[in-house]
């Protein structure tokens, strides 16, 4: 088989022969040299999937539960293309599974318990496994047959497809439980019914149930949605308020050497050739001689999806969770109020030394996970491997964007209600050495330009967007001569001056001598003409504060600011000499975790804060002399955030804005993967 | 979420003067730079002066040096702009516009993440 052929699994007769028609129609259309389609028939979705595993086929299009299937060892596939509905200019890969009430019930999600519950049907996503396999763990206790635990949770329900004379409860609203239309209560429509005729007190369907059921505004304002940090919004909220963001149908490869390039070459000219509305005698979403066929007929295209994404992250914490607790029934020993040891994500062995330390004197509170770059970190908070981690604002907008929310703010000055005041921000400024008598703001091109890392505010993000609203493209390697970047691609003159070793050269970690604001400040002393850093970076390595080598001779008299009016000012005059003022470095964490991590942390910089005199015997959590490990070093307290308890409104518009500009000249694969699954 | 509130504007004979005045509401407490734009028919809009409203500094367009003057009270969350002299050639449309992020030193409109509905000013010969 040549190495540009796609091997389809295909699970049935109906599907080989379809699968041979894709194949010799997409022969007709495509060069030689071009993509081709072999076909390879199994007798199931998980024979495909082992197949797959095994390099005996390609690819399959899969459910939500088998891509969970796929994902897992020693399966190990992950989505690479998705199919969508809607229209091309709104593009639909993702349905919301919600939990509906009448706006009057006055419960919440952690209240249903003894209320009457409607289910679209037994084994179905949106409608049992995913809100039984959230509240798997509510449940009492045998929780095996499973029917029987949910039969004796809620006071009555309709499931249909249940079986009534095991489980009468479960068919309680729905005499008979009838597995099809017949039962007037079956399906996404009918479990909405059970909730609008008054039979159940919540409904578990797809977001869309609503509008398609109710297309009168006035009516849906009857009922809301309830949200699994047990409050209420409109339905029309959906994405802000579900129970689990599902894919509908998704293409899987291997995870290595899985041709996913080729995949998306390959279905990217068969939807331009065979997509909706496109030719009379093959079409790619219709199945003459049967229903959905290797893709859904309700699809309209296909969409890739973004490298960066592996299972975990495509089907989301909260459906991975569901079906976990479904799958493996495993719950704590006993449901408690205590929380749970928050997992600190540190980054790289530098942090990793300074969390163990705080682990062990935290006596267990603190657990550490480590990650080699913060996106990483926020990966692996998103799929619940971590849980919290400190990051510079540029981070908290792409934490932002992945669904993860800031719950504490790092305060940098001394007041008496320092917990309780969240500072409005620092400074980003730019600095130079005073003997570079000639630079300005206006003439830095091809200069020498330390950052602190690609997307953090003061070292990117502002500079970078200053720098974008002038120059109008993002090619900013070819504004400076050279640079150190940390995170920059490693073949770019933005990793030229850096001075990691080996692997670790220009890496956004302190393996990385040049990295964050001390490294930043370090390039500027050792190579660079400028440096992009805080207002408080010059002060803290100078005069002989810091006491490495290359900086304990150091005075701040040598250096000054870049003004944007094109002037110079002396180092203290940051407040009328600054690039911009930036948001806070803050805390996030999941939102389930937010009243846990918020918790913890203030009992942990009562015990290990400031009010510590001394560090050189005692732990100090906002101290690891000027490197800024886990907290910046200047981190007087944590503060609450009172309102300002969501990126969006704790970042500022104007940064979100100002980020989100960037966001063509952006790099994250993270970001791309999260705008994925929240555009 | 912020809001912008000019007023003061008015029609002047060339030679007078005039005071605008910008009300600010909602998350104001951390203003990094506040300031007066103007546009004419038909042109660009301008900057004409800022203020760093935690060190009282300001910043003066070449056009209104000497003859315009930008003040604060930050009790009241009001930015004021006294213009004296004025000539016909600043009739325009004067907005008040704000950032949270960005410094002043620049009267770089694309710094400028707020701005109020306008206040006209017009000034006859």
């Known amino acids: 088989v040549p190495d540009k052929t796609v091997r389809w699994c295909a699970v049935s007769e109906h599907e080989a022969t379809k699968c041979q028609s894709f194949r010799d129609h997409m022969k007709s259309v495509i060069p030689s040299d071009g993509p081709s389609v072999a076909c390879v028939k199994k007798a199931s979705y998980l024979d495909c999937i082992r197949a797959i595993a095994a390099n005996e086929a390609d690819a399959v299009t899969l459910d939500a539960g088998l891509v969970y299937d796929a994902y897992l060892a020693p399966n190990n596939l992950k989505p690479v293309v998705a199919e969508f509905y809607g229209s091309k200019e709104d593009p639909q890969t993702f349905y919301y599974a919600v939990a509906v009430v009448k706006k009057d019930s006055g419960f919440q999600m952690n209240q249903l318990r003894g209320k009457k519950s409607c289910h679209t049907g037994l084994g179905r996503s949106a409608g049992w496994n995913i809100p039984i396999g959230l509240l798997y763990c509510d449940l009492p206790e045998p929780r095996k047959p499973l029917e029987k635990a949910v039969a004796n949770f809620f006071s009555g329900s309709c499931a249909p497809c249940a079986d009534g004379t095991d489980f009468p409860q479960l068919c309680q609203l729905c005499p008979g439980c009838g597995c099809s239309t017949l039962n007037q209560y079956f399906g996404y429509s009918g479990a909405f019914k059970c909730l609008k005729d008054g039979a159940g007190d919540v409904a578990f369907v797809k977001h869309s149930t609503i509008f398609e059921n109710l297309a009168n505004k006035a009516d849906r304002d009857q009922y809301e949605l309830l949200c699994l940090d047990n409050t209420r919004k409109p339905v029309d909220e959906y994405k802000d308020c579900h129970l689990a963001q599902v894919p509908s149908h998704t293409v899987v490869a291997r995870s290595m050497g899985g041709k996913e390039d080729l995949i998306w070459e390959l279905l990217n000219q068969a939807q331009e050739h065979f997509g909706k509305d496109k030719s009379k005698e093959f079409q790619l979403f219709s199945s003459p001689h049967g229903k959905d066929l290797l893709f859904k007929d309700s699809a309209h295209g296909f969409l890739k999806v973004p490298p960066r994404m592996d299972a975990k992250m495509y089907l989301g914490y909260e459906y991975v969770t569901a079906i976990r607790n479904l799958r493996e029934g495993t719950c704590p020993e006993a449901p408690t109020d205590e929380c749970k040891p928050v997992k600190w994500c540190a980054l790289s062995h530098h942090e990793r030394l300074k969390c163990d330390e705080w682990s062990v004197n935290s006596v267990g509170k603190i657990e550490c996970v480590s990650a080699e770059t913060t996106e990483d970190c926020i990966a692996k908070i998103m799929n619940g491997e971590a849980d919290a981690m400190s990051l510079d604002g540029g981070f908290v907008y792409i934490a932002g964007k992945c669904g993860l929310v800031p719950v504490l703010a790092e305060n940098y000055n001394k007041s008496d209600n320092c917990e309780d005041t969240p500072e409005a921000g620092y400074f980003a400024i730019a600095v130079v050495k005073k003997s570079a008598s000639d630079l300005t703001w206006d003439n830095l091109k091809g200069k020498k330009s330390c950052h602190t890392a690609v997307g953090r505010t003061a070292g990117w993000n502002i500079p970078m967007g200053l720098l974008y609203n002038k120059i109008n493209h993002c090619r900013f390697d070819e504004f400076f001569s050279e640079g150190c970047a940390p995170g920059s691609k490693k073949d770019s003159s933005l990793c030229k001056l850096c001075m990691g070793s080996g692997l670790n050269l220009c890496e956004p970690n302190n393996k990385e001598g040049y990295y964050g604001y001390t490294g930043a400040f370090r390039c500027l002393v050792e190579k660079g003409d400028v440096a992009f850093v805080k207002h408080q970076t010059v002060p803290q390595n100078t005069g002989g504060k810091n006491p490495d080598p290359w900086a304990k001779n150091l005075n701040e008299k040598d250096y000054e600011l870049l003004c944007l009016d094109g002037t110079r000012k002396p180092v203290e005059e940051y407040a009328n000499c600054h690039l911009a003022r930036a948001p806070n470095h803050a805390v996030v964490t999941r939102k389930d975790k937010e009243a846990c991590v918020h918790k913890i942390l203030r009992q942990q910089q009562h015990l290990f804060g400031s009010n510590v005199t001394d560090c050189s015997g005692n732990f100090c959590l906002f101290r690891s002399e000027t490197k800024d490990l886990l907290f910046r070093d200047d981190t007087v307290c944590l503060a609450k955030l009172h309102d300002r308890n969501t990126y969006e409104k704790y970042l500022g518009e104007e940064y979100v804005k100002a980020v989100g500009n960037l966001r063509k000249c952006s790099t994250s694969s993270l970001l791309e993967a999260c705008t994925f699954r929240r555009p | 979420d912020v809001q912008l509130v000019e007023s003061g504007g008015g029609s002047v004979q060339a030679g007078g003067s005039l005071r605008l005045s910008c009300a600010a509401s909602?998350?104001?407490?951390?203003?990094?730079?506040m300031g007066w734009f103007r546009q004419a028919p038909g042109k660009e809009r301008e900057g004409v002066a800022t203020?760093?409203?935690?060190?009282?500094?300001?910043y003066y367009a070449d056009s209104v040096k000497g003859r315009f003057s930008i003040s604060q009270d930050n009790a009241k969350n009001t930015v004021y702009l006294q213009m004296n002299t004025l000539k016909p050639e600043d009739t325009a449309m004067y907005y008040c516009?704000?950032?949270?992020?960005f410094g002043c030193g620049s009267l770089a409109k694309s710094l400028f993440g707020y701005w109020g509905q306008g206040t006209l000013v017009t000034v006859s010969s």
């Open positions: 909602g998350y104001t407490r951390s203003f990094t730079c």
């Open positions: 203020i760093n409203p935690g060190t009282g500094s300001t």
């Open positions: 516009a704000a950032t949270q992020l």
